[in-house]
Structure formats: structure tokens, C-alpha cells
Interface confidence: medium
């Protein structure tokens, strides 16, 4: 007698590994024999699809080599024209051993920055990822975390984070290990011992001592009054990532000696500087034909702006140059209390470096003016509005003329860095904070410095400490 189809073995969930065989069985009782069709996610599986084998009159569906994308709901439908068609469905869950799809790579990172070692994985069940440093499992802490993606993130990288790392991906089917990678931590050049200033008699021997560290170990160069040291002997030794340099000098003239420690980080260099002055007793009394002399800055107003122990030019056209120049700065400084927080630190740097110009010692001490480009940057980028107001006040006679001449330089009359970079002084404030300038190139002077966030307030001495540190 004709009998409508009945599925005697309903489909079940099948777990299968990638590249293995997976079989669904759909046992049917009926008369006459039914036609059995198969679907995956409601899409008909074609009989001639070579990825599948359909046997036993359609009752067995075999996936010959399971792929990741075969996941889904498989249904068999039986129909013999007697009664309605019947259907049974089951899921295929593709199981996969852990696989590391994006392994970590060797990383060189500067101390204090954030390092991320990638480790992206595949697998079913989803693998858990852990990390090994050296031979031990890595413990997470407030700085070190394994991200949801499996990547390892290290905040504020420290020297002790350097070493060999590998990631481990684990699930119920197995474990995968990445290759071992190296995290190298580089450290900016830093001066541990700065050279000391000396006041000596003419013809003395003096040894200046400078010690620096960093990873890689820095090199030390000595600069005399802005130029490479031309005389004197240098002895160097390196031990435990510390370089020790001694410069022995025969003193015949006063000078500013700078120890510069430099190390390389990829294409960039980090430098640390420390300076010492060598003065000769009775030397720097101004002679009649001199316009001024070099001396260490001993005032207060520009302390946070000028480098520590900076040699500045004191103008002997004043009866008491130190007092007079300090008063000029003080008067102009008070005017700056009302300017914007963006303009103020730049204007202070310009003001101090203009009134107390860097001094090149020698038989005739020479002031080193500010570079034109830095002057323009302060005038047009940081202080466009304020500069206009200041010039207006000057024209209306609200400043004493010498006050204006000294505190507001005429940028176009200053030497350009293009001519001779050593013939003019840079404003360290502008160098140090260059990465803080988000809006660049500068907008027009009608849209001045308010576009520039995050510049430090005048109380910040981050740009003026000595030894100074800068990336070049």
C-alpha cells in the first residue's frame, strides 16, 4: 500500500574538523521510494556538486572535505507524492584547531611609549590567547594586558619589558604557538653627570667630565661656543650602557662648552645636552671698545626660559647692564599677563632671548640674535592678535621707545637660518613642543593662535631645563 514518507532518523548536530569528512544521515521509510533533496541554509545542494557525495538513494549526505565556510543548517526533504513532504534539519559545527593568522613581529620601541604585539587567531571553539616571556607565562598587570583580539599591549614600556615573547592559542582541539619575537626597548640619551663650570686663570688645564646613558649607548660630542671642539684631548670609556667622556682643555679664552649625547632610534636621533662655562679670572670686564660682555644669566624673570647657566650678552651702554636688562624684561613681562595661554609661553621665550641674547664669547663678545623664522612664527602663528595690539601701542607712544626696540624685535631685520644656522639662536620652546601643534601649516594671521591646543603654560619649564632633551 502507498505510504507517506516518515523520517526515522532525524538529523543531528554534527561536529567536524576542517579538511575532515562530515556525514548527515536522513533515514526515510515510505512507499513508493521518495525523492530526497538536501539544502544548506535553505539553498539547494546540487547533485553534481563535487564537494558533496549523496548516496543510499539520497539518505546519506557526505561533505568530502569540510571547510570553515560549511558551517550552517542542513535539511533533508523527502517526498513521494503520498501525503506531504517531510523535513528534518541539523547543524554542522565546523571545529577548528587554533591557528595564528597574524603572528607577532619583532618590535623596537622607545621607553615610555606603548607597544602592541599582534596575535590574531582563528579556531572553533574560539581559542584563548596567552603569552610567554622568555620561559615563563606572562602575568598581566596595570601596564600589561592581553586584548580581546589576542594582541599584547604594554603601556609605558620599561627597560625590563625587553625580551623574547611568543603567543599561545589554545582550544579543546589543540594548541598553536607563534614564533619567538624580540621586544627591544630603546632609551633616549640622558646625561647622568653634566660638566661643571670653572673660573680659572689664563693658561690653566681643565678637565670637563660628561657621563651619559641610553639604549643604544649614546655617542658624546663636545661643542665649544657653537662649533666642534678644535683643541683639547678627549678620552672615552663605555661600561654597562654608560659612556664616560673627559675633555681636557688648555684655557686661553673663556667659552661655553656643551656635551651632546646622541643615540639613534630608527631614522630619528635623540639628544641630551649639558653645558659648562669656562671663565677666566678678570677676563670679562668690558673694554672701552666693547659694546658688552658675556656673563651667566643671574636674573629671575627669564629663569624658566633661558637654559640653566646660559651665557648671555650684557649691554654696556647701560650703567648696570644686568639690572637694566632685567628691568626691561620685567616691564614687558607684565604686559604678557593679559595675553592668551597660547601666545604667552612663545612670547616669553622670544622676549627673554631677545633682551638677554645668547652670547658668543671671544676677544670681542658677540650677541647672537634670534633666527628670523622663529620670530615670524611667534609673531604670525602664536601671537598674531597680540602682536598687532603691541605694535599699535608702540605707534601711539604707550611704550617707551627703547622698550619697544628691545622687547619686540623686527623679524625682517633678524638673520635667517637659511644663511647660516649657527649665526642665529633658536627658541627652544618652539622646538620642544612642535608635536603639540595640531593645526599646521599655520592658518592666516586673521585666524591666529587659538587653533593650537595643548601648549604648556608659562609655568612649565619642560622646554628650558638643562640638560635639555630633544628629538631631531
Amino acid at each position: 500500500l502507498p505510504k507517506a514518507p516518515v523520517i526515522t532518523t532525524p538529523l543531528e548536530t554534527v561536529d567536524a574538523l576542517v579538511e575532515e569528512v562530515a556525514t548527515f544521515m536522513c533515514a526515510v521509510e515510505s512507499y513508493p521510494q521518495p525523492e530526497i533533496s538536501w539544502t544548506r541554509n535553505k539553498i539547494l545542494i546540487k547533485l553534481f556538486d563535487t564537494r558533496y557525495s549523496i548516496r543510499e538513494n539520497g539518505q546519506l549526505l557526505t561533505i568530502l572535505s569540510v571547510e570553515d565556510s560549511d558551517d550552517g543548517i542542513y535539511c533533508c526533504t523527502a517526498n513521494n507524492g503520498v501525503g506531504g513532504a517531510v523535513e528534518s534539519c541539523g547543524a554542522l559545527q565546523v571545529k577548528m584547531k587554533p591557528k595564528i593568522t597574524r603572528p607577532p613581529i619583532n618590535v623596537k620601541i622607545i621607553e615610555g611609549l606603548k607597544a602592541v604585539l599582534p596575535c590574531t587567531t582563528m579556531g572553533n571553539p574560539k581559542p584563548s590567547v596567552s603569552w610567554i616571556k622568555g620561559d615563563s607565562p606572562l602575568r598581566e598587570n596595570s601596564r600589561i594586558a592581553v586584548l580581546e583580539s589576542g594582541s599584547l599591549r604594554i603601556h609605558n614600556v620599561q627597560k625590563e619589558d625587553a625580551g623574547q615573547y611568543r603567543c599561545v592559542a589554545k582550544n579543546s582541539l589543540g594548541t598553536a604557538y607563534s614564533k619567538v619575537v624580540k621586544l627591544e626597548v630603546e632609551v633616549f640619551a640622558r646625561i647622568l653627570r653634566a660638566p661643571e663650570s670653572h673660573n680659572v686663570t689664563f693658561g690653566s688645564f681643565v678637565t670637563l667630565h660628561c657621563t651619559a646613558t641610553g639604549i643604544p649607548v649614546p655617542t658624546i660630542t663636545w661643542i665649544e661656543n657653537g662649533n666642534a671642539v678644535s683643541s683639547g684631548s678627549i678620552q672615552e670609556s663605555v661600561k654597562d650602557r654608560v659612556i664616560d667622556s673627559r675633555l681636557q682643555l688648555f684655557i686661553t679664552k673663556p667659552g661655553l662648552y656643551t656635551c651632546i649625547a646622541t643615540n639613534k632610534h630608527g631614522e630619528k636621533f635623540s639628544t641630551a645636552k649639558a653645558a659648562a662655562t669656562i671663565s677666566i679670572a678678570e677676563w670679562s670686564k668690558p673694554q672701552k671698545d666693547n659694546k658688552g660682555y658675556c656673563a651667566q644669566y643671574r636674573g629671575e624673570v627669564c629663569n624658566a626660559v633661558l637654559a640653566k647657566d646660559a651665557l648671555v650678552f650684557l649691554n654696556t651702554s647701560y650703567a648696570d647692564p644686568e639690572e637694566a636688562q632685567e628691568l626691561l624684561v620685567h616691564t614687558a613681562w607684565n604686559e604678557l599677563k593679559v595675553v592668551s595661554p597660547v601666545c604667552r609661553p612663545a612670547a616669553e621665550a622670544l622676549l627673554c632671548n631677545h633682551i638677554f641674547q645668547e652670547c658668543s664669547p671671544g676677544v670681542v663678545p658677540t650677541p647672537i640674535p634670534i633666527c628670523r623664522e622663529y620670530c615670524l612664527a611667534v609673531k604670525e602663528l602664536f601671537c598674531a592678535k597680540e602682536w598687532l595690539v603691541m605694535e599699535e601701542k608702540t605707534h601711539r607712544g604707550l611704550y617707551r621707545s627703547e622698550m619697544h626696540l628691545l622687547s619686540v624685535p623686527e623679524c625682517s631685520k633678524l638673520p635667517s637660518m637659511h644663511w647660516d644656522p649657527t649665526a642665529c639662536a633658536r627658541l627652544p620652546h618652539l622646538d620642544y613642543n612642535k608635536e603639540n601643534l595640531k593645526t599646521f601649516p599655520p592658518m592666516t594671521s586673521s585666524k591666529p593662535s587659538v587653533d593650537i591646543p595643548n601648549l604648556p603654560s608659562s609655568s612649565s619649564s619642560s622646554f628650558s631645563v638643562s640638560p635639555t632633551y630633544s628629538m631631531t
Epitope: K268, D431, E435
Partner: antibody, heavy 124, light 107 residues
């Protein structure tokens, strides 16, 4: 000696792509800005794009925005201009030029060194 | 965008003449204006930067000046090698613009 050498120009069909390279030597690439400037036959100079190495900031002329991408590989001292969806009006000699100076003062420096130029022809 | 309107578009002059080329910015700009000289088939050469600074190696007969939004390139005494096309350029805003050029020809 400072040198900028462009390469990658040639004939391309409208809608096609081309990548220009600018190999630099003789200066600190990472503290300079690189600009691409083009000149259509018989016409004046037209700025195309700039990249400020110290900040990574990029800027584009309206005529190329969304189609061209400027980039720099400081490890290779090379700047690139990826040009997609090219049009007949992009036909020009493309120069790369640099501005020196620290971050704030680059714009006061002018483009002091230029390459010899590479010709890009967009035609069917 | 800041437009740089350069005038004249061309001029004829003789050796020894004083030549003045002007660029007017469409809005207030800083001193970030440069002048270039270009000869046929060659890359431009920087003459003046920061509106009035003479680039190293450029003869002193070239000079630049600024008055508000007007920028001027002056050649005090034209020489045979000065016959070329001159361009002004501003980089005061993030979008750089060039003037349309002035061709200096022999009279």
C-alpha cells in the same frame, strides 16, 4: 648634496592608477616636509599635496582630494603620490619639492629643492 | 582657499631695466610667501622666502617686499639670464597656492 628624484610617470588611461615616487637624499627627511606640484603642458604651477614628516599631517588640493594619496616612508627617505581615478586634466609634469626647517617654521622656508619632474599622461 | 593674483601675466623688458611683479592675496596672509623662477623644461628655483628673505646663492638684484596683502618681487637691473617665468606662492594656510605666473620676455 641634496637630491630629489621622481619616478613612476607614464601613459595611463582615464580612470586608471599610477604611483609616483620621490627618492630623497642629502638632508634629514624626517624633519622636512615634502610637496607634490604639477604643471600641465604650457600652464602654470599647481600645488597638489603636502606631507609634514614630523607630524604625518597630509593636505590636498581640492582638485585631487579623494583621488590622490600622499605618503612617506622615512626608513627609505621616499615620498609617494598614489593617483587613482585619473582624468585627462591630470596630465602634467609632476615635481616633488621639499621645505626644510623645524615643524613650526617650515612654511616660512619656501620649497628650496625640487626634483627634475616626471611626466604623467592620461589619455585613451 | 587663498587666491594669489599675480600681475602682469607677461611683460617685455630690456637688459638693465628695473622689473616689478606683484602678487595680491585674496585674504590676510602671514609672511609665508615665496617667489620662484622657472625656465622652459626646468624645475622652478627658489628666489625669495618669508616674503623678503633672499635665498642663498641668489643674486642681490632680486628682492621681495610685503605691504599688507600685496607682495612684490623686484629685479633691480634685469640681466640676460633673468628672462624666465616667475611665480609667487603662499603657504600661510594649509592649502598652498601659486600665482598664475609672469613671463618676462626680451623687448
Amino acid at each position: 648634496e641634496v637630491q630629489l628624484v621622481e619616478s613612476g610617470g607614464g601613459l595611463v588611461q582615464p580612470g586608471g592608477s599610477l604611483r609616483l615616487s620621490c627618492a630623497a637624499s642629502g638632508f634629514t627627511f624626517s624633519s622636512s616636509s615634502i610637496h607634490w606640484v604639477r604643471q600641465a603642458p604650457g600652464k602654470g604651477l599647481e600645488w597638489v599635496a603636502s606631507i609634514y614628516s614630523s607630524s604625518g599631517s597630509t593636505y590636498y588640493a581640492d582638485s585631487v582630494k579623494g583621488r590622490f594619496t600622499i605618503s612617506a616612508d622615512t626608513s627609505k627617505n621616499t615620498a609617494y603620490l598614489q593617483m587613482n581615478s585619473l582624468r585627462a586634466e591630470d596630465t602634467a609634469v609632476y615635481y616633488c619639492a621639499r621645505s626644510g626647517g623645524e615643524f613650526y617654521i617650515t612654511s616660512y622656508y619656501g620649497m628650496d629643492y625640487w626634483g627634475q619632474g616626471t611626466l604623467v599622461t592620461v589619455s585613451s | 582657499d587663498i587666491q594669489m593674483t599675480q600681475s602682469p601675466s607677461s611683460l617685455s623688458a630690456s637688459v638693465g631695466d628695473r622689473v616689478t611683479i606683484t602678487c595680491r592675496a585674496s585674504q590676510s596672509v602671514s609672511s609665508a610667501v615665496a617667489w620662484y623662477q622657472q625656465k622652459p623644461g626646468k624645475a622652478p628655483k627658489l628666489l625669495i622666502y618669508s616674503a623678503s628673505s633672499l635665498y642663498s646663492g641668489v643674486p642681490s638684484r632680486f628682492s621681495g617686499s610685503r605691504s599688507g596683502t600685496d607682495f612684490t618681487l623686484t629685479i633691480s637691473s634685469l640681466q640676460p639670464e633673468d628672462f624666465a617665468t616667475y611665480y609667487c606662492q603662499q603657504s600661510s594656510s594649509s592649502l598652498i597656492t601659486f600665482g598664475q605666473g609672469t613671463k618676462v620676455e626680451i623687448k
